[in-house]
């Protein structure tokens, strides 16, 4: 139960943790199981224990094996195993699938590849990404902390992603890769009578006669690329286009993909230097798509200035 | 609702709806029909000087709806009748959705039959 399989390639840097986690203040004693025989914590040594962590620095082939971790407080003990294969470097670009970590898979909106077990290691930036052992180029990739982002993702990005990193010890500098596949899912999009965030139904603004206002139609139409979707204002049922007041203007505001995946609209109505007039119109957020229309009326109400008198 | 009755597949019928008791400021108007033992069915709705109209897949093409503002009513055309258009044919309306799902529908009109047969 308490056993992990951890894997590596001969000559690069290999760091294992305990499969049986303890406070930092536990102590941490590591065997060669087939042995019993003690790691030593000495770091002179290319393998070493270093708390809950077992170094390989670097790892050789006959390193494989099962390695025993006890972490030990004052009143328990726990046990562990971690179950280490050191593999030889292949002559070719073939990643073997033992040589694979857990497959991720992305979507035009979420392309991240983490890059598996590096924050075992001390390592800095940048990292160094391949896909089918070629070297990512081009404006499209981006090496961030300790994932790749990919833009635009095509079914074409799948394939195995291999990060490439430095581990650094006492100055000493360890090479480290992992590779793992990365597959790309269709997102399926779907739209849904609009709903409209703001402005609230009957909504009362209040406004300064002279100065500017400006009102913003917000709405959501369902999960990815919309068709036929719009948000815009009228004025007493009339386009602003139509209404013939060149004070009033909408103008279009950002394309919105919320965290939530929701795809959203905004309009903003900018009304310069508000008139008494403006106060008897019907402000309409209007927000339609292929399954119908949605409004929210606003009105306008004149914010008295605050009489600074005392 | 006015306009209901039988007529022979292929022929054409004219349904109307008046409105009262809103000032003009932006309303939607629907067709909605119900066959027995079927449920509620959207068939055509319209926004304000119908700029925004909406027709169900079944009457595209057929169909038409239509407003006259200044005597609040909106009408439905319907050409080509089929026998699977026979049903009670409603008029609703709403002042702030609009599209075929009757759930947002306010005010309801008593309805109209259209039968036609083969």
């Known amino acids: 139960k308490f056993s992990k399989q951890s894997w590596g390639l001969e000559n690069e840097a290999l760091i294992v943790r305990c499969p049986r986690q303890g406070k930092p203040s536990y102590t941490v004693d590591w065997y060669y199981s087939q042995t019993n025989k003690s790691i030593p914590t000495q770091e002179r040594n290319r393998v070493f224990a270093s708390g809950q962590l077992l170094k390989f620095l670097p790892a050789a082939v006959a390193d494989s094996g099962i390695y025993t971790c006890i972490v030990r407080s004052p009143t328990f003990n726990r046990t562990g195993y971690a179950n280490v294969t050191i593999y030889k470097k292949q002559s070719d670009c073939n990643v073997p699938d033992y040589l694979m970590y857990s497959t991720v898979s992305g979507s035009e909106k979420n392309s991240k590849i983490y890059c598996p077990t590096i924050d075992l290691y001390n390592w800095t930036a940048p990292l160094e990404w391949f896909k089918n052992c070629q070297a990512l180029q081009g404006s499209r990739y981006r090496a961030h902390k300790s994932f790749l982002v990919i833009d635009n993702v095509m079914t074409e990005d799948a394939g195995d992603y291999t990060c490439k990193f430095i581990h650094n010890e006492n100055g000493a500098n360890y090479s480290v890769t992992a590779t793992r596949s990365f597959t790309v899912k269709d997102e399926q999009g779907f739209s849904l009578f609009p709903v409209i965030g703001a402005p609230a139904q009957n909504e009362i603004k209040e406004v300064e006669i002279g100065k500017n206002a400006n009102l913003t139609c917000s709405a959501c139409f369902g999960k990815g690329t919309q068709f036929l979707a719009a948000v815009l204002w009228q004025l007493n049922g009339t386009k602003i286009t139509d209404f013939g007041e060149p004070r009033i203007q909408q103008e279009e505001g950002q394309n919105q993909s919320f965290s939530n995946g929701l795809a959203c609209l905004d309009m903003v109505l900018r009304i310069a230097d508000v008139k008494e007039e403006d106060l008897l119109l019907q402000y309409d957020c209007l927000a339609l798509n292929l399954h119908g229309l949605r409004r929210h009326t606003v009105r306008l109400s004149r914010k008295n200035p605050i009489d600074h008198h005392s | 609702e006015s306009g209901g009755g039988s007529v022979q597949a292929g022929g054409s019928l004219r349904l109307s709806c008046a409105a009262s008791g809103y000032t003009y400021s932006g309303i939607c108007m629907g067709w909605f029909r119900q066959a027995p033992g079927k449920e509620r069915e959207g068939v055509a709705a319209i926004y304000t000087n119908g700029e925004y109209t909406y027709y169900a897949d079944s009457v595209k093409g057929r169909f038409t709806i239509s407003q006259d503002n200044a005597k609040n009513t909106v009408y439905l055309q319907m050409n080509s009748l089929k026998p699977e258009d026979t049903a009670m044919y409603y008029c609703?309306?709403?002042?702030?959705?609009?599209?075929?799902?009757?759930?947002?529908?306010?005010?309801w009109g008593q309805g109209t039959q259209v039968t036609v047969s083969s």
């Open positions: 609703a309306a709403d002042r702030n959705t609009c599209g075929l799902r009757g759930d947002f529908y306010n005010y």
